[in-house]
């Protein structure tokens, strides 16, 4: 049995995850993640599903966070800013935005790097999934430590 | 005995730290910190060592964070962006990067301020140290509240 | 009784809040918040007072965070950067700054969006209030998820 699970007793195991960004050829705005490098997956009460969403088994309050580093250029990008969104999909409910951050593109060439950090406390239902959406996944930086996603149960 | 330590019982004391940036004349890229101002040091299960690293005595999952505010100018800086890295040194292991954030330098004169926030959940071993490394420490802002570093044990 | 309150037992209930930004006609630099949208208010041990401060009833260590997205333009703004401050008012004490972040205004027109994230671990006394102050509230973005404020008791 996982040592994290035992620390707080069987009735109240530690639940936490931290996953690492993965470049994807998919034409989707939802970022892809992997259990690689210095990742955390405390036990099976939180899982990474389809490489894109963290799904929890237990209801409760969770601190959920994401960090996205991206490289963009004002001239090469649309006029709209780069936006990263932390989103929620609960069973039987529509997807909804929990948190968003926006950064205007840099004038640096070929592109200028910027980092966004999102985080907040939210109640999740059993089976709820959280995921990260960006305006342009091709601009996301996947170098060591630049882009990650995680949660912890309070 | 510290009141934080007693809250959760002797077997599972609260472990948390929040330290404040300190300007340094040292020619090192590792940021210096101090227990000053509105700092937190819950008990001796987390310590600030050599003014540069937070070291933990107990294995477990920790939420670790850092905030760095810096002031830089594109013309006066190297072409490379300002990068802040949250790093880990575990006993018997190599140093490694946990998290990084990058911001392209501003065109504002004499310099333009920007803030970076890093945070994530990681497992730490007994004796593990975490620290913050930046590309140019001379650009870091040390005014009240601008640059800080901390952790909490889940 | 609130389900969050029961999870950790009556002696140690979960205490957490996450509130959503609200546009205000008030000429104050203190941001306004509301219990709307996907907000969190675990129980009456943390309350939102006057729409501007989170007040706690119990002493202890809290992770406190704020995220502010704003849209500004260098030419239309003062030369000073946009600064967001997380502040503390404890009973019988002066207000003090816990955390600050600064971002230089964008050259994008009519304005360029940027996001700031603040977070740290602090000890709060019973009756302590935390609030968020910005240099120019009229520049703050109130779209879904862009600007929020919260805390959790360790």
């Amino acid at each position: 049995e996982n040592s994290f699970e035992m620390q707080k007793g069987d009735q109240n195991p530690q639940i936490a995850a931290h996953v690492i960004s993965e470049a994807s050829s998919k034409t989707t705005s939802v970022l892809q993640w992997a259990e690689k490098g210095y990742y955390t997956m405390s036990n099976n009460l939180v899982t990474l599903e389809n490489g894109k969403q963290l799904t929890v088994k237990r209801q409760g309050l969770y601190y959920i966070y994401a960090q996205v580093t991206f490289c963009s250029n004002r001239e090469a990008s649309s006029q709209a800013p780069f936006i990263a969104s932390l989103c929620l999909k609960s069973p039987g409910r529509f997807e909804r935005i929990l948190l968003r951050a926006a950064n205007t593109h840099s004038s640096a060439k070929p592109c200028g790097q910027q980092s966004i950090h999102l985080g907040g406390v939210f109640e999740l239902q059993p089976g709820a999934s959280v995921f990260v959406n960006v305006t342009d996944p091709s601009q996301v930086s996947h170098g060591t430590g630049f882009t990650s996603f995680g949660l912890l149960k309070l | 005995e510290n009141s934080f330590e007693m809250q959760k019982g002797d077997q599972n004391p609260q472990i948390a730290a929040h330290v404040i940036s300190e300007a340094s004349s040292k020619t090192t890229s590792v940021l210096q910190w101090a227990e000053k101002g509105y700092y937190t040091m819950s008990n001796n299960l987390v310590t600030l060592e050599n003014g540069k690293q937070l070291t933990v005595k107990r294995q477990g999952l920790y939420y670790i964070y850092a905030q760095v505010t810096f002031c830089s100018n594109r013309e006066a800086s190297s072409q490379a962006p300002f990068i802040a890295s949250l790093c880990l040194k575990s006993p018997g292991r190599f140093e490694r990067i946990l998290l990084r954030a990058a911001n392209t330098h501003s065109s504002a004169k004499p310099c333009g301020q920007q803030s970076i926030h890093l945070g994530g959940v990681f497992e730490l071993q007994p004796g593990a140290s975490v620290f913050v490394n930046v590309t140019d420490p001379s650009q870091v802002s040390h005014g009240t509240g601008f640059t800080s570093f901390g952790l909490l044990k889940l | 009784e609130n389900s969050f309150e029961m999870q950790k037992g009556d002696q140690n209930p979960q205490i957490a809040a996450h509130v959503i930004s609200e546009a205000s006609s008030k000429t104050t630099s203190v941001l306004q918040w509301a219990e709307k949208g996907y907000y969190t208010m675990s129980n009456n041990l943390v309350t939102l007072e006057n729409g501007k401060q989170l007040t706690v009833k119990r002493q202890g260590l809290y992770y406190i965070y704020a995220q502010v997205t704003f849209c500004s333009n260098r030419e239309a703004s003062s030369q000073a950067p946009f600064i967001a401050s997380l502040c503390l008012k404890s009973p019988g004490r002066f207000e003090r700054i816990l955390l600050r972040a600064a971002n230089t205004h964008s050259s994008a027109k009519p304005c360029g969006q940027q996001s700031i994230h603040l977070g740290g671990v602090f000890e709060l006394q019973p009756g302590a209030s935390v609030f968020v102050n910005v240099t120019d509230p009229s520049q703050v973005s109130h779209g879904t998820g862009f600007t929020s404020f919260g805390l959790l008791k360790l």
């Epitope: 490098g37 210095y38 060591t144 | 090192t28 890229s29 590792v30 540069k52 690293q53 790093c87 040194k89 018997g92 292991r93 190599f94 140093e95 490694r96 990067i97 140290s129 620290f131 490394n133 | -």
Partner: nanobody
């Protein structure tokens, strides 16, 4: 590419002291984790001590940590090993090693030779009884 050149070896009596040096040249050694290994006649090369690139944090072989001290001077791009109370069994060729510290995987231990990218030619230490 980093070049490593050891010096400071020689003949010393048991109970004596020596300080070994390792001069690094080429690319900046600031981003390199540095270590000393040694190889006694007829034996395999073994870990002595290591020092990290950023913190200057040290790790030692359990059997040597009370007598040996590793240090580095980044300004001079030099690694040192101070050896006190030397014993005949410390007789060996002492090697300096370096490892770039980016993109290191979770399981990499500082005492394993295979993780080091660059090696010096070694300096011989002989301890007579």
């Amino acid at each position: 590419e980093v070049q490593l050149v050891e010096s400071g070896g020689g003949l010393v009596q048991a109970g004596g002291s020596l300080r070994l040096s390792c001069a690094a040249s080429g690319r900046t050694p600031l981003n390199y984790h540095m270590a000393w290994f040694r190889q006694a006649p007829g034996k395999e090369r073994e870990f002595v001590a290591a020092i990290s690139s950023l913190l200057g944090s040290t790790d030692y072989s359990d059997s040597l940590k009370d007598r040996f001290t590793i240090s580095r001077d980044n300004a001079k791009a030099t690694l040192y090993l101070r050896m006190n109370n030397l014993k005949p069994e410390d007789t060996a060729v002492y090697y300096c090693a370096a490892r770039e510290t980016t993109h290191i995987s979770t399981s990499d231990r500082v005492n394993e030779m295979r993780h080091y990218d660059y090696w010096g030619q070694g300096t011989l230490v002989t301890v007579s009884s």
